[in-house]
């Protein structure tokens, strides 16, 4: 038999950040190689990642056709070396994935604090609009043009010289806060759809950024800062 | 100072798709601003249809959902409302609208503030 | 849904008196995205309020709004005669995006 000895795929799961979509599974492959199927609920199965070795298949190229329908993979197992017959009619192992709707799943991104300008008692605090490759008239759109106002940002600041934190929140990339004169602030952002229910609905925290340093003054921490 | 003039059939019959474009003039639909679809039935109050913003990300009232498809064309600067199988009870007035960033307690959130005239669109056979 | 109630229904004035419209949401709305329209007959809404409190550009005085959670009021502290018209919140925070029923601010 053309799939003897080799082993169904298991715990088929997709890892998405931004978009960039990944699926991944089990077992590191011993003598048996796999091939991976992506199709909407609706459309016709389509084949990647040809007889890899690998347990990970980057079907990003698929999703962002249209990030909002739902997909499933499929990965089928094969022997190693096995060349595509066409007088074979046995179906090879395969596992399903789970369904996967991309605009609703894709984890966010940490975000990264773009700039920031104080003019007397307020900060323009700007934060940097992610490239996706999810694309409209073969042109890249950011993670703003795909989300639009499901996507808001929340900002974080304190006074360099306390603990107690403030927060705004913006429906574009841009805040404008108050400040005290005088006084220094760190700021970190966080992405944020709050539409979402799971556990995917916020980004991790961008890196802090903090007023009154001159570049790479601070290196020790770990933070990089803007100097206006 | 921008501008938007709705156009389309004002008599569409019934189970037929209603089609409509609103023109932006005085500045660049793809200024970072939403565009929207409301209507208002005879006498009544307003209803949200939906948005859309330059780079085709669609937002629709759930209600409507299934019927309704908002369009761009930066081209033209213009963005359209197509609103399939209609029934009398989608007789209205049709407004196109901006949505622009307004500054509110440290960031920016986005409120209708510029309206086209409105345009009646009747179903009937 | 939010769904928006607004209260009374009409209100019978005179120019120079005080118009105090309320607006009651089925559950909390951000204060960010409670909007009061203008209409009158034949014209399109116009924007007033934004933020619950905040005029828009080019709003007289007279106009102010309040509240947060789910009670928003909307004050005409002196009628004048171009006031009169049919007013509108909206809360534009949860998709679908509501209105009120309206208020009709009429001439006693």
């Known amino acids: 038999s053309g799939t003897t000895n080799t082993v169904a795929a298991y715990n088929l799961t997709w890892k998405s950040t931004n978009f960039k979509t990944i699926l991944e599974w089990e077992p590191k492959p011993i003598n048996q190689v796999y091939t991976v199927q992506i199709s909407t609920k609706s459309g016709d199965w389509k084949s990647k990642c040809f007889y890899t070795a690998d347990t990970e298949c980057d079907l990003t190229d698929e999703i962002v056709k249209d990030v909002k329908q739902t997909y499933l993979a499929r990965v089928f197992s094969y022997p190693a070396g096995h060349v595509e017959s066409t007088g074979s009619t046995e179906e090879p192992p395969y596992e399903n994935s789970p369904e996967f709707t991309p605009y609703l799943e894709t984890n966010l991104g940490q975000p990264t604090i773009q700039s920031f300008e104080q003019v007397g008692t307020k900060v323009n605090v700007t934060v940097q609009d992610e490239w996706t490759l999810v694309r409209r008239n073969d042109t890249f759109l950011s993670l703003r043009d795909v989300f639009g106002k499901d996507l808001i940002y929340t900002l974080y600041y304190w006074k360099s010289s306390s603990s107690g934190k403030k927060t705004a929140k913006t429906n574009t990339n841009e805040f404008l806060i108050d400040v005290d004169k005088g006084e220094n602030y760190c700021f970190s952002v966080q992405a944020v759809i709050p539409s979402r229910r799971t556990a995917n609905r916020k980004s991790t925290d961008s890196p802090v950024e903090c007023m009154g340093h001159e570049k790479g003054e601070s290196r020790e921490t770990g933070h990089h800062h803007h100097h206006h | 100072q921008v501008q938007l003039q709705e156009s389309g059939p004002g008599l569409v019959k019934p189970s037929q798709t209603l089609s409509l474009t609103c023109t932006v003039s005085?500045?660049?639909?793809?200024?970072?601003?939403?565009w929207s679809w409301i209507r208002q039935h005879p006498g009544k109050g307003l209803e949200w249809i939906g948005e859309i913003y330059y780079s085709g990300s669609t937002r629709y009232n759930p209600s409507l959902k299934s019927r309704v498809t908002i369009s761009v064309d930066t081209s033209k600067n213009q963005f359209s409302l197509k609103l399939s199988s209609v029934t009398a009870a989608d007789t209205a007035v049709y407004y196109c609208?901006?949505?622009?960033?307004?500054?509110?307690?440290?960031?920016?959130?986005?409120?209708?503030?510029?309206w086209g005239k409105g345009t009646t669109v009747t179903v009937s056979s | 849904e939010i769904v928006l109630t607004q209260s009374p229904g009409t209100l019978s004035l005179s120019p120079g008196e005080r118009a105090t419209l309320s607006c009651r949401a089925s559950e909390s709305v951000d204060s960010s995205y409670l909007a009061w329209y203008q209409q009158k007959p034949g014209q399109a809404p116009r924007l007033l309020i934004y933020?619950?409190?905040t005029r828009q550009t080019g709003i007289p005085d007279r106009f102010s709004g309040s509240g947060s959670g789910t009670d928003f009021t909307l004050t005409i502290s002196r009628l004048e005669p171009e006031d009169f018209a049919v007013y509108y919140c909206?809360?534009?925070?949860?998709?679908?995006?509501?209105f009120g029923g309206g208020t009709k601010v009429e001439i006693k």
């Open positions: 005085g500045g660049s639909i793809s200024s970072g601003q939403y």
């Open positions: 933020g619950a409190s």
């Open positions: 609208a901006r949505d622009a960033p307004y500054y509110y307690g440290g960031g920016y959130y986005y409120y209708m503030d510029v």
């Open positions: 909206q809360q534009a925070g949860v998709v679908p995006y509501t």
